[in-house]
């Protein structure tokens, strides 16, 4: 006699929405072998019953979690073999707070991952990283955890936040912090991981301040060029004057990235060009606000966006994405900034 | 000079409240996060609460937690502890206690007010 | 929680006298450890911080070791105003938690 399950393991982790078969079969000698699946739940699966075998369907609720058995006999002999199952939600929805850092500042990170399953802080682990490795120095705080509102009942799924104290960044700052959730299930290990943005001065190391009206360029990678030309800002008088922005190059390696910069002619209009090879074209993804109450023209390798109606740039985060390759620049473009008539 | 000086320290029935205070001076108060630290006759030191800068985060021990709330009044440079039924074993010298930024460890202490807990 | 073990609880020791005290930590807290001085009546005061940095104005017979999980307190020469209560603390995670504390008496 040959007594098998499939998959074999004796745990299972199945992802919620997600349907799994376990398929239990014994072959015998002397007729046919009686197999079946006890200690089911009512709500647990469905068994599909042939001759020599037992299918049990999983079909990835919460309600599926348990430990089924399955027994098979032939003549005087029997086998078992159970099965705990693990249904587990772990989707890649993971929120950070602030959206980007400003080096100098005494500040608290966020990294909340939603709709979670299961809620076990010895399950779900938090990471900040620099590069591939925990940042030295930071301070975990409390994490945090709460039930997520549910459209339907029934499904008691959580969010868990973790806050961390950032240490000094350094001189320079590194371009991004990375929070990485890990969830760690019976011979399953799923990462998830969100990038948190570190504001890159233009003119000066100092951070930002509500006079201040230096723009920040933002690269979403250690490896990026992010480059911002011609743009000829004044400030109000409650601000200081700063010089006109030259290229900052945060690194000579890595994919090259789409630069911005002011188209001169147009006033307050920025242009997104690629920045190499043919085939290559940009558009614009974010603004403050909503992007569609901008006036875009996209040619190709070229992008512009302005203000409808014409008038100063509003204050936030612009965006410009290059493909193929995904590359993004990002330019911050501060308040009290108004376009410089004479350039 | 960097100055924090406790008071509102005394005797208590059990069940009973009192409010403890933190006066700060010499240095930005708004800027530091701020701890109150106990110490029990002959005992350790047990970290009690903590509060950021602005107020915006707090967190207690969970041996207080629902029954002390840390605040602060930074136009005042001056940190609170209201410690609500209290009990017995809440008898202890309470120290507050100014943390690093970036290094967190606790580099200024004041010296301490006593609180006594008794029937 | 972290759990913070010092040893040993109390020793004795003459002026003049290396001394050395440790701390465990349950698990691994990198450098996020400070050691701290007390005499009686009074307040707590920081003699380390970052594991191994000296806080301005300590003596420099102070010194700190250790990262991850086990670290080292040492006194290079014993002076009669250092016998007192020595603490450490790990603030890497929240609850901040001390050692038990080691008090170094005369002997």
């Known amino acids: 006699q040959s007594f098998q399950v499939n998959p074999p393991e004796s745990e299972v982790a199945v992802a919620m929405g997600t349907s799994l078969q376990i398929t239990c079969s014994m072959s015998c000698d002397e007729g046919v072998a009686r197999v079946h699946w006890r200690g089911l739940d009512t709500s647990l699966g469905s068994v599909q019953t042939l001759p020599g075998s037992s299918i049990l369907s999983v079909r990835g609720m919460l309600s599926d979690t348990g430990t089924p058995v399955c027994v098979g006999s032939c003549g005087s002999r029997s086998f078992q073999h159970s099965v705990k199952i693990l249904v587990y939600a772990f989707p890649d929805q993971l929120v950070v707070s602030p959206e980007f850092l400003v080096p100098g500042q005494d500040q608290v990170v966020s990294c909340t991952a939603h709709n979670i399953w299961p809620a076990d802080p010895n399950s779900l682990s938090f990471a900040l990283l620099l590069g591939e490795q925990r940042l030295e120095g930071a301070q975990a705080l409390e994490p945090e955890q709460e039930e997520e509102i549910q459209e339907a009942e029934g499904t008691p799924l959580f969010r868990m936040t973790q806050r961390w104290r950032l240490p000094s960044l350094g001189t320079p700052a590194p371009p991004a912090l990375h929070c990485q959730v890990t969830m760690q299930l019976p011979k399953l290990v799923l990462t998830h991981r969100k990038e948190i943005p570190v504001l890159q001065s233009q003119t000066s190391p100092k951070p930002p301040n509500t006079t201040s009206a230096e723009p920040y360029i933002l690269t979403s990678s250690s490896t990026a060029e992010a480059v911002s030309t011609g743009l000829n800002i004044t400030t109000l008088p409650s601000a200081p004057p700063y010089p006109k922005l030259s290229p900052r190059t945060l690194s000579s390696e890595g994919p090259c990235r789409p630069k911005i910069h002011q188209d001169l002619e147009a006033g307050w209009e920025l242009l997104c060009e690629a920045s190499c090879g043919p085939g290559v074209t940009v558009r614009w993804t974010l603004a403050p606000g909503d992007l569609a109450t901008y006036h875009k023209r996209e040619a190709g390798a070229q992008a512009w966006l302005s203000v409808l109606p014409p008038g100063p740039m509003v204050e936030g985060w612009f965006q410009c994405r290059q493909d193929p390759g995904g590359e993004v620049t990002n330019l911050y473009v501060p308040g009290q900034v108004t376009p410089n008539s004479s350039s | 000079e960097v100055q924090l000086l406790e008071s509102g320290g005394g005797l208590v029935q059990p069940g009973g409240s009192l409010r403890l205070s933190c006066a700060a001076s010499g240095f930005t108060f708004s800027s530091y996060w701020m701890h109150w630290v106990r110490q029990a006759p002959g005992k350790g030191l047990e970290w009690v609460s903590y509060?950021?800068?602005?107020?915006?985060?707090?967190n207690y021990a969970d041996s207080v937690k629902g029954r002390f709330t840390i605040s602060r009044d930074n136009s005042k440079n001056t940190l609170y502890l209201q410690m609500n039924s209290l009990r017995a074993e809440d008898t202890a010298v309470y120290y507050c206690?100014?943390?690093?930024?970036?290094?967190?460890?606790?580099?200024?202490w004041g010296k301490g007010t006593t609180v006594t807990v008794s029937s | 929680d972290i759990q913070m073990t010092q040893s040993p609880s109390s020793l004795s020791a003459s002026v003049g006298d290396r001394v050395t005290i440790t701390c465990r930590a349950s698990?691994?807290?990198?450098?996020?450890l400070a050691w701290y001085q007390q005499k009686p009546g009074k307040a707590p005061k920081l003699l380390i911080y970052?594991?191994?940095s000296l806080q301005s104005g300590v003596p420099s017979r102070f010194s700190g070791s250790g990262s991850g999980t086990d670290f080292t307190l040492t006194i290079s020469s014993l002076q009669p105003e250092d016998f007192a209560t020595y603490y450490c603390?790990?603030?890497?995670?929240?609850?901040?938690?001390f050692g038990q504390g080691t008090k170094v008496e005369i002997k």
């Open positions: 206690a100014r943390d690093r930024p970036y290094y967190y460890d606790l580099d200024v």
């Open positions: 603390q790990q603030y890497k995670s929240y609850p901040v938690t």
């Open positions: 970052a594991a191994s």
């Open positions: 698990q691994s807290i990198s450098s996020s």
């Open positions: 509060i950021s800068g602005s107020g915006g985060y707090t």
